[in-house]
């Protein structure tokens, strides 16, 4: 009889994660009698995958009936493949004995597992930055195989070029991870902007995965302040407005000071959005000038998003308003929010500092 050969016809087999793999093996002789065993890897550390004679291998079944007369087909079927199953599989013939003795091994079949990358996760900076500053966004995706992968960055549909990408590990592995960091220069118009990380891989059949981050999470647009005096509402009452415009995020506290003393503090809430995603806020202060002998220095103090306060002051000239006898009201304060503000033509009694 001819000498036994163990034939593994495929040098390599590629399978998508979750699918089943068939690893083929035939022998050329019924002699010697003894079991076939399948191993992953070679040498002393090889891992037993299937033993025809004994053991429980829930994910592995023999393709042909092992009890069939003249059976020389010892191919196996491995179900629910994961990236951890990747490796070189050897079909090994043993001679029956106590213990069984290895006779001959097949040449091996390399199983590679095509695994989809996880959905890209984009994370932005921990703290907000203002326009003209550069912020970094990181994109991560894991668990893919093979190693070849393409990653692109976009801002509002425009491809970015300032980014660095690493795929780990550098050597052979059952699966890989990608991490990319893109640098984005912010503008005041970026509240509604979005960065997109796009990952293309052979397992995705031309339909890349995308991860997004909103620049609204990364940007701070500081407000413009303008303090103006409006027309007189009544005798001895001056209406002063503080217009806080084009700011983001909404977190803002406004404090009125009269001659350095806190008159009123307000918190912005439920403001309507401008088209560009920023917010405006107008606050009024009614000052009863008859209660003052000297000019009144009004300060609009704005603390935006935990940043140092910004002040804008305005002097109300008491001499320009004749005193009304018997008045004992120091000041009458009202404040309101207003979506848009109108520039008043009557700006005759205000000073900018």
């Amino acid at each position: 009889e001819e000498e036994l050969q163990v034939i593994q016809p495929e040098k390599s087999v590629s399978v998508a994660a979750g699918d089943s793999a068939t690893l083929n093996c035939t022998v050329t002789s019924l002699i010697p009698v003894g079991p076939i065993q399948w191993f992953r890897g070679a040498g002393p550390g090889r891992e037993l995958i299937y033993h025809q004679k004994e053991g429980h291998f829930p994910r592995v079944t023999s393709v042909s009936e092992s009890t069939k007369r003249n059976n020389m087909d010892f191919s196996i079927h491995i179900s629910n493949i994961t990236p951890a199953d990747a490796g070189t599989y050897y079909c090994v013939k043993f001679r029956k004995g106590s213990p069984d003795v290895e006779v001959k091994s097949g040449a091996g079949t390399e199983l590679s597992v095509r695994a989809k990358p996880s959905a890209p996760v984009v994370s932005g900076p921990a703290v907000r930055a203002t326009a003209e500053h550069t912020v970094s966004f990181t994109c991560e995706s894991h668990g893919f195989s093979p190693r070849d992968i393409t990653l692109k960055w976009f801002k509002n549909g425009n491809e970015l070029s300032d980014f660095q990408t690493n795929v780990d590990p550098a050597g052979k592995s059952v699966s890989y991870s990608i991490r990319s960091t893109a640098r984005v220069v912010l503008t005041r118009r970026d509240v509604h902007s979005q960065v997109i990380c796009e990952v293309a891989h052979v397992t995705l059949q031309g339909d890349p995965l995308r991860g997004t981050a909103n620049l609204s999470e990364a940007i701070r647009v500081p407000p413009f302040l303008e303090v103006t005096q409006q027309s007189m509402r009544a005798d001895n009452q001056v209406n002063v407005t503080c217009q806080v415009t084009k700011f983001y995020p909404q977190r803002l506290q406004l404090t009125w000071l009269e001659n350095g003393n806190v008159s009123r503090t307000e918190m912005a809430s439920a403001l309507p959005e401008n088209k560009d995603g920023t917010y405006n806020w107008t606050s009024w202060l009614l000052v009863n000038v008859s209660a003052h002998r000297d000019d009144v220095k009004l300060t609009c103090q704005v603390e935006h998003d935990g940043q140092p306060a910004v002040n804008k002051s305005f002097s109300v000239k008491v001499s320009a308003h004749p005193k009304e006898q018997g008045s004992n009201t120091a000041a009458e304060n009202t404040g309101t929010n207003e979506r848009d503000y109108k520039d008043d033509d009557d700006k005759h009694h205000h000073h900018h500092h």
Epitope: I31, G34, Q52, K53, E54, N71, K96
Partner: antibody, heavy 119, light 110 residues
Framework: QVQLVQSGAEVKKPGASVKVSCKAS????????INWVRQAPGQGLEWIAM????????HYNQIFKDRATLTTDTSTSTAYMELRSLRSDDTAVYYC????????????WGRGTLVTVSS | DIVLTQSPDSLAVSLGERATINCRAS??????????IFWYQQKPGQPPKLLIY???NRDSGVPDRFSGSGSGTDFTLTISSLQAEDVAVYYC????????FGQGTKLEIK
């Protein structure tokens, strides 16, 4: 190691039935045929039948086709041979044997079960 | 059905001498490139033990003084140098079709 442990000796009256068991261990029960062979006192070996525990496929010696039934219980890795309508010439040691190479041979044997048929 | 006939029915051989047992099939047992003949040894009070499979292949643990040969219809089991522990009954079996046994050959020491 492969072990086949058979049930104890039986004494039966003519016309009765006997069911001999064979519990397998040390290997995957469903991967190998089980044969049944008998040996009358001072006589040679006589093949009765064989069963594939994976799907209960059976092959019988024509002499025993109408009287013998082979079954298996894969949950306990046990094979059974029932012989009906016993006669005195059925007195024999009944062996189960495992076919390791699917060559329709008998690689590992049980110790045998003596069945005595006597009135 | 294939009938196997062993010869002789009994055999006495001196220790250290060669013992030869023959088995003839009523028709060829060769199929798929193999001779489907097996040899067993049975000692008193014990089950049989497989010695040779597919005509010429020693089973594991079988001493190399045992050998099998032959093809087609005529087969031989040879014990090159008889030992005391070889006293037993020897059976041939075929499985080209379903298994059948020869009638057995009793081997004794002369």
């Amino acid at each position: 190691q492969v072990q086949l442990v058979q049930s104890g000796a039986e004494v039966k009256k003519p016309g009765a039935s006997v069911k001999v068991s064979c519990k397998a261990s040390g290997y995957t029960f469903t991967n190998y045929w089980i044969n049944w062979v008998r040996q009358a006192p001072g006589q040679g070996l006589e093949w009765i039948a064989m069963i594939d525990p994976s799907d209960s496929e059976t092959h019988y010696n024509q002499i025993f086709k109408d009287r013998a039934t082979l079954t298996t219980d894969t949950s306990t890795s046990t094979a059974y041979m029932e012989l009906r309508s016993l006669r005195s010439d059925d007195t024999a040691v009944y062996y189960c044997a495992m076919d390791y190479g699917s060559l329709y041979a008998m690689d590992y044997w049980g110790r045998g079960t003596l069945v005595t048929v006597s009135s | 059905d294939i009938v196997l006939t062993q010869s002789p029915d009994s055999l006495a051989v001196s220790l250290g001498e060669r013992a030869t047992i023959n088995c003839r099939a009523s028709q060829s047992v060769r199929s798929s490139g193999y001779n489907w003949i097996f040899w067993y040894q049975q000692k008193p009070g014990q089950p049989p033990k497989l010695l040779i499979y597919l005509a010429s292949n020693r089973d594991s643990g079988v001493p190399d003084r045992f050998s099998g040969s032959g093809s087609g219809t005529d087969f031989t089991l040879t014990i090159s140098s008889l030992q005391a522990e070889d006293v037993a009954v020897y059976y041939c079996q075929e499985s080209r079709e379903l298994p059948t046994f020869g009638q057995g050959t009793k081997l004794e020491i002369k």
